[in-house]
């Protein structure tokens, strides 16, 4: 392990379309990938009239956009589907939205998914 880097071995798993995709709905996902490449966790969600709807959470393959991010934060301004990625076991349990291009004070939407 490289000092100062959070290695990702498992992520929170969630799939809103679990029946269609024939997967579990929630759980812990072990992250696989080429041995020398980095692994990350991700979360995707929608904001439907102020209500947060999680789409998917799980493991994400080596991506420089995710390097050294201990928190899962979406910075894109008003995306259709929100996406964030991070490094460290289960780092996708909580996720936030901090738009980068906002002139006004950004607001956070931290969410901890609760099993149904």
């Amino acid at each position: 392990a490289i000092l100062g880097r959070s290695e990702t071995q498992e992520c929170l798993f969630f799939n809103a379309n679990w029946e269609r995709d024939r997967t579990n709905q929630t759980g812990v996902e072990p992250c696989y990938g080429d041995k020398d490449k980095r692994r990350h966790c991700f979360a995707t969600w929608k904001n439907i009239s102020g209500s947060i709807e999680i789409v998917k959470q799980g493991c994400w393959l080596d991506d420089i956009n995710c390097y050294d991010r201990t928190d899962c934060i979406e910075k894109k301004d008003s995306p259709e589907v929100y996406f964030c990625c991070c490094e460290g076991n289960m780092c996708n349990e909580k996720f936030s939205y901090f738009p980068e291009m906002e002139v006004t004070q950004p607001t956070s939407n931290p969410v901890t998914p609760k099993p149904p």
Epitope: K37, V55, G58, L61, D62, E80, V81, F83
Partner: antibody, heavy 115, light 111 residues
Framework: QVQLVQSGAEVKKPGSSVKVSCKAS????????INWVRQAPGQGLEWMGT????????SYAQKFQGRVTITADTSTSTAYMELSSLRSEDTAVYYC????????WGQGTLVTVSS | QSALTQPRSVSGSPGQSVTISCTGT?????????VNWYQQHPGKAPKLMIY???KRESGVPDRFSGSKSGNTASLTISGLQAEDEADYYC???????????FGGGTKLTVL
């Protein structure tokens, strides 16, 4: 093992559209990006665009903006690249590749644009 | 994003070393460790050899190495073999906020 299998060769008329598919297997499709790259005969590689397979977010090279559409169907682990308003200069082999590092590639799809 | 600059061709004899350069700008190659190298044999799909400037893709012989100095990334192939004869492309990571770009390609001839 990771595999990206693309649809077969196409012959198209100028002005028409083509839609190339790329079916992924051997890994979780929604765990990375799919990139599209083309190569005209005897020429180099040209990046066209990318899609985040889980969120559907796309980015396109300026050259193809407005003419290319990349989509992903997570239920079939398949990505698609549609190029419209075809011209003879679009004759090329079109490749899909996995992830930001392009670590696995499809076999390529030859698209010929000819009247 | 403008294309990266590579020499059109390089050559070397078996057993020798060759280096292929890939020049960008201070805002791409110079400031980020996201340059990759691909090998392409005629009629085949490209193959990732080096990613993140210097990391060797699994299964790639250690004769292939990558480095960077300033705005120029380099691929060095030592102990040249006949099967190394191919086209080599440098390119950047593409995804999220990063847009992809390739070099024009370098034809390596093993004499």
């Amino acid at each position: 093992q990771v595999q990206l299998v693309q649809s077969g060769a196409e012959v198209k008329k100028p002005g028409s559209s083509v839609k190339v598919s790329c079916k992924a297997s051997g890994y979780t499709f929604t765990s990375s990006y799919i990139n599209w790259v083309r190569q005209a005969p005897g020429q180099g590689l040209e990046w066209m665009g990318t899609i985040n397979a889980v969120s559907g977010s796309t980015s396109y090279a300026q050259k193809f903006q407005g003419r290319v559409t990349i989509t992903a169907d997570t239920s079939t682990s398949t990505a698609y690249m549609e190029l419209s308003s075809l011209r003879s200069e679009d004759t090329a082999v079109y490749y899909c590749a996995r992830g930001g590092w392009f670590d696995y590639w499809g076999q390529g799809t030859l698209v010929t644009v000819s009247s | 994003q403008s294309a990266l600059t590579q020499p059109r061709s390089v050559s070397g004899s078996p057993g020798q070393s060759v280096t292929i350069s890939c020049t960008g700008t201070s805002s791409d190659v110079g400031s980020k460790n996201y340059v990759n190298w691909y090998q392409q044999h005629p009629g085949k799909a490209p193959k990732l050899m080096i990613y993140g400037v210097s990391k060797r893709e699994s299964g790639v012989p250690d004769r292939f190495s990558g480095s960077k100095s300033g705005n120029t990334a380099s691929l060095t192939i030592s102990g040249l073999q006949a099967e190394d004869e191919a086209d080599y492309y440098c390119g950047t990571f593409a995804g999220g906020k990063y847009y992809g770009v390739f070099g024009g390609g370098t034809k390596l001839t093993v004499l």
